[in-house]
Amino acid sequence: ESWEPCVEVVPNITYQCMELKFYKIPDNIPFSTKNLDLSFNPLRHLGSYSFLRFPELQVLDLSRCEIQTIEDGAYQSLSHLSTLILTGNPIQSLALGAFSGLSSLQKLVAVETNLASLENFPIGHLKTLKELNVAHNLIQSFKLPEYFSNLTNLEHLDLSSNKIQNIYCKDLQVLHQMPLSNLSLDLSLNPINFIQPGAFKEIRLHKLTLRSNFDDLNVMKTCIQGLAGLEVHRLVLGEFRNERNLEEFDKSSLEGLCNLTIEEFRLTYLDCYLDNIIDLFNCLANVSSFSLVSVNIKRVEDFSYNFRWQHLELVNCKFEQFPTLELKSLKRLTFTANKGGNAFSEVDLPSLEFLDLSRNGLSFKGCCSQSDFGTTSLKYLDLSFNDVITMSSNFLGLEQLEHLDFQHSNLKQMSQFSVFLSLRNLIYLDISHTHTRVAFNGIFDGLLSLKVLKMAGNSFQENFLPDIFTDLKNLTFLDLSQCQLEQLSPTAFDTLNKLQVLNMSHNNFFSLDTFPYKCLPSLQVLDYSLNHIMTSNNQELQHFPSSLAFLNLTQNDFACTCEHQSFLQWIKDQRQLLVEAERMECATPSDKQGMPVLSLNITCQMNKT
Amino acid sequence: QKHYWVCNSSDASISYTYCDKMQYPISINVNPCIKLKGSRGLLHIFYIPRRDVKQLYFNLYITVNSMTLPKRKEVICRGSDDDYSFCRALKGETVNTTVSFSFKGIKFSKGKYKCVVEAISGSPEEMLFCLEFDIIHQPNSN
């Protein structure tokens, strides 16, 4: 093809020419190309009008092209270019007009390009620029040059992993002249020693990220005090898991936060035991979102009912016991992967709509009732990957629930009553791998709106699937894999008119029967892989519903003998439905073991007696 | 397949091969070398990714003396405000990082352990690299 050795991803639009040892821009790519990836080619030098042949370009990736020189007008003619990526080029010479002609550029990535200063970076005319990423460079001064006043659309400025040590009032002077309240600024991984008090006074930012910046606690404390007067929608403070500088931590380091106006606050990776931190929390009482990630925290009883938090996130923290959580305004609580408190205790969260309590190894003495959470507004509840959860109440007061996940927790008392009877609005239910033994046909009664039911990895009395789905008239997805099933009721699926996907894989079925699927007019996917299917259990195999598009019978134990000839022929007749048909192999007899079922030619003669 | 030696410890010998077509060079150092009976140390990685690292996860396929364990998925980078600094690494950017590790050992039986690490990243998801680690465990060696 004309574009080779490049790869045509979307004809006439997208071409990938990555790592092809090109020394120059290829000339066999269509004029109409919009996305061009030339990364990892030794281009080394970009002269004027280098891309004249591609006037329609919108995205140009020049990562790791060993570019050392970019001449005036190198990108001239690229008036539609919106993204230019220059990551990993050891640029030594950048002409003043290097970026001229880029009248639509919105994203410029100049990460790891040996950039030593923003002052000499010739981008002042790029009025459309929204995102400037100059991370991983050699920039020492945080002074935002005068030309920034032209960049009125700038939303993201990434200066992380540079060499900035000091921030002075004059550095941010230009921000006072422009209404950039939407600017997100990332200064992480700069060795900051000093922020002059007043430097951020009356400056508004959308997001400020300061992670792994400070070598010791006193520096952190004075620098946070230096942020006084800043109004920021989201502030992210702390460290990275693999970039730890602070040996210890105490709450006084964060006292300066009281002098900021913050809407959302996130603290990550601080090795400390935050104890008695009510003063700090009081400073942050009016934020709408509060996150602690990987922070050792003894107790959070200091959270006040009156805090205005609407979203609280506690992830991978250590607690002495499950915290007392009583918060009037909270709408979302994410409490995941925490260590310490092993037993859940009631929370009082009257506005709560979203609750994720997954991956904590918690035991629940009872579940689930409005009284456990103090709310009747709950729509989303994730209790997955916990310990023993004893089902003692059928969700009284939690009738608004739409999403419920118990996977990989150990559910007790599931077959004693209709646990889900109140949940007429539930759309998604996952009880996979919950040690549930279905011994009660009313287990799913009440789930009138349910669309997705995942119950893989459980078991059934006598390994028989009874008529337990009678209420689930809106079900579209059902996973019954790994349930040790051997037989099913012929009417098990009779009410599931909307079912589209049915996973019966990894069970112990020895024969295939199409009869139970006759009432599934919407069925598109049926997976019977990893069973022990040898044959069909009746002579007359009916057709599957006409809607069926994918039938998976791989990794079964097909008996490729004459007595099963009609079944094997039937399988061949379903050829257009079969998924990975080449993995359907004979198990018996031994001389045919491993042979693909579809390639068999079984000619059997009837013995006349 | 060329084997790249990583290190030897008192109870393990670790090496890897590439299990993808690309075989983009990756440098791995472990100090001190992992002891299966339990150890802590630093894993140093030097790598130039061929795609953005954001939303990185590993698929782990572990084989113990030719018995295959179920696939494990380990999410490393979720996409914003991530735990690790390398989650923000872009295609073509040098990743030169040290990650501390510690684990309490469980009693491993003597033998050969294989761990295929499929690194998937980006949106749309594609393979970043694939390494197959060979760990030979000699519980009683000095």
Partner: antibody, heavy 118, light 107 residues
Framework: QVQLQESGPGLVKPSDTLSLTCAVS?????????WHWIRQPPGKGLEWMGY???????DFNPSLKTRITISRDTSKNQFSLKLSSVTAVDTAVYYC???????????WGQGTLVTVSS | EIVLTQSPDFQSVTPKEKVTITCRAS??????LHWYQQKPDQSPKLLIK???HAISGVPSRFSGSGSGTDFTLTINSLEAEDAATYYC?????????FGGGTKVEIK
């Protein structure tokens, strides 16, 4: 509207076991919440004794732990208090109550006076 | 356990006067403190939860404040029907504990 009603003997002999029952109407005791006993000696303040959770789990005031039992009869929608080895200091008005999700008590029975005397 | 100390034990007040009752906790309990009113021969009635949140149906003359260890219940303009004993209760941790009570009498 939830209503609670205590019942039981008004007079108990020293060293005997005090037994009280709380009948609940308007809400199932297995449907949610925890169900508490509080007592008040004549002319004195309130003392929390213990509770039974809707799941059947119980917890007690450490000062009474060796003598107290709280159980329930779900078919009758009632829960009971047993306090063994009583003495005169156990003379009090005994209240049953329902705790809300937070640790506060919005619903109380009207109380029943139990006198310990020979 | 957390000890709650109420003061005064007794208060005799004329109608329309302002009444202030204080409750001090032996350790910080954030705002996990609740107030009850108990009239003679009646069971306690919840007035205020979480230090300052009035329960619906409670007259607006009752208000609460405080956080940490020091809390106050205020009756802004005392009425004859307010003659009762008032108790604070901490909901910070089990065992639940009550203050000793403050008896308010109408002069």
């Amino acid at each position: 509207q939830v209503q609670l009603q205590e019942s039981g003997p008004g007079l108990v002999k020293p060293s005997d076991t005090l037994s009280l029952t709380c009948a609940v109407s308007g809400y199932s005791i297995t449907g949610g919440y925890s169900w508490h006993w509080i007592r008040q000696p004549p002319g004195k303040g309130l003392e929390w004794m213990g509770y039974i959770h809707y799941s059947g789990y119980t917890d007690f005031n450490p000062s009474l732990k060796t003598r107290i039992t709280i159980s329930r009869d779900t078919s009758k929608n009632q829960f009971s208090l047993k306090l063994s080895s009583v003495t005169a200091v156990d003379t009090a008005v005994y209240y049953c109550a329902r705790k809300d999700s937070g640790k506060w008590l919005p619903y109380w029975g009207q109380g029943t006076l139990v006198t310990v005397s020979s | 356990e957390i000890v709650l100390t109420q003061s005064p034990d007794f208060q005799s007040v004329t109608p329309k006067e302002k009444v202030t009752i204080t409750c001090r906790a032996s350790q910080s309990i954030s705002d996990h403190l609740h107030w009850y009113q108990q009239k003679p021969d009646q069971s306690p009635k919840l007035l205020i939860k979480y230090a300052s949140h009035a329960i619906s149906g409670v007259p607006s003359r009752f208000s609460g404040s405080g956080s940490g260890t020091d809390f106050t219940l205020t009756i802004n303009s005392l009425e004859a029907e307010d003659a009762a004993t008032y108790y604070c209760q901490q909901g910070h941790s089990f065992p639940l504990t009550f203050g000793g009570g403050t008896k308010v009498e109408i002069k």
